[in-house]
């Protein structure tokens, strides 16, 4: 069971300082952006991180949403990352959900965050370059210290 708590507005970056944003096709991509670019591209660069209390505490349970014309929420259904047109629900009556991730700081690096899927244990949000794109994907952690699954989260409130 997950119950919604408060939400915050955040900019999410990978460890190469690329900014996560939502493309016109509602796809999450990372790109090099100046602070000015980041502001100019809002709200596509501003993510709503909603925190949830968890009946089985496993880290800070969160959803990640964005509000452009409508609110869309990040999902890892079938291990494919996409934004689905939905509000983060007030309650989720299950111990797993495709939209719930456990946000944890990286041991020894309090400013670096990881997001583990509640649906797929051991799978994390990651940034990987595929052809010309820096994509947000779901990735099985295959090595300790994998920088691709680490992010910085800058509060914009």
């Amino acid at each position: 069971y997950f119950g919604k708590l408060e939400s915050k507005l955040s900019v999410i970056r990978n460890l190469n300082d690329q900014v996560l944003f939502i493309d016109q096709g509602n796809r999450p991509l990372f790109e090099d952006m100046t602070d000015s670019d980041c502001r100019d591209n809002a709200p596509r660069t501003i993510f709503i991180i909603s925190m949830y209390k968890d009946s089985q505490p496993r880290g800070m349970a969160v959803t990640i949403s964005v509000k452009c014309e409508k609110i869309s929420t990040l999902s890892c259904e079938n291990k494919i990352i996409s934004f689905k047109e939905m509000n983060p629900p007030d309650n989720i009556k299950d111990t797993k959900s495709d939209i719930i991730f456990f946000q944890r700081s990286v041991p020894g690096h309090d400013n670096k965050m990881q997001f583990e899927s509640s649906s797929y244990e051991g799978y994390f949000l990651a940034c990987e370059k595929e052809r010309d794109l820096f994509k947000l994907i779901l990735k099985k952690e295959d090595e300790l210290g994998d920088r691709s699954i680490m992010f910085t989260v800058q509060n914009e409130d």
């Epitope: 493309d23 016109q24 796809r27 991509l29 291990k79 494919i80 052809r131 010309d132 994907i137």
Partner: antibody, heavy 120, light 108 residues
């Protein structure tokens, strides 16, 4: 609704260059999240990926065809093109153009295909 | 370059039966970038399954995909007469795409 249409000569002589163009309608070719690909199918055989191009011009080719293939894009015309040089009878095939969605690298929209025959 | 091998080459079954088509990769397919297509005679292929599991828009739920790593399966739970055509798997890895050689589903 997105539509792709292949065009080009149906007959090419051996050792010459096969040239095809794909015209995209119902959507813009200059999207960040899509690539544009060519796939061929010899008569009675399976599908073979030839290559894909991004709207900014970067190309990715089948290693077995790379030395003979050039794919280019004309964003203002919403078209992309295939050139295959030094053709032989083995290049006779139905040639398809398709959109490749980067979410799962899947060909989700296809043209109806055009038969290119290599013969003297 | 990853090579995909589909088996069997031809599968003979009757309408209403369950079909299991296999696609095996020469190396592990990253991030489940394994897709399935159906091709009817004289037509372009049509996307059925993407990302190993997800049904494309408008595809009936009798089609399902499974697998990971090097072994993937397309299952058709109860065959309809129009399902007796050719099926291809396709993968993406290291910027390169490739297709399997196809499985022909024929009426027994």
């Amino acid at each position: 609704q997105l539509q792709l249409q292949e065009s080009g000569p149906g007959l090419v002589k051996p050792s010459e260059t096969l040239s095809l163009t794909c015209t995209v309608s119902g959507g813009s070719i200059d999207s960040r999240i899509y690539y544009w690909g060519w796939i061929r199918q010899p008569p009675g055989k399976g599908l073979e990926w030839i290559g894909s191009i991004y709207y900014r011009g970067s190309t990715y080719y089948n290693p077995s065809l790379k030395s003979r293939v050039t794919i280019s894009v004309d964003t203002p015309k919403n078209q992309f093109s295939l050139k295959l040089n030094s053709v032989t009878a083995a290049d006779t095939a139905v040639y398809y153009c398709a959109r490749e969605d980067s979410s799962a690298w899947v060909f989700d929209y296809w043209g109806q295909g055009t038969l290119a025959t290599v013969s003297s | 370059e990853i090579v995909l091998t589909q088996s069997p080459g031809t599968l003979s079954l009757s309408p209403g039966e369950r079909a299991t088509l296999s696609c095996r990769a020469s190396q592990s397919v990253r991030n489940n970038y394994l897709n399935w297509y159906q091709q009817k005679p004289g037509q372009a292929p049509r996307l059925l399954i993407y990302g190993a599991f997800s049904r494309a828009t408008g595809i009936p739920d009798r089609f399902s995909g499974s697998g990971s790593g090097t072994d993937f399966t397309l299952t058709i739970s109860s065959l309809e007469p129009e399902d007796f055509v050719v099926y291809y798997c396709q993968q993406y890895g290291n910027s390169i795409d490739s297709f399997g050689q196809g499985t022909k589903l024929e009426i027994n």
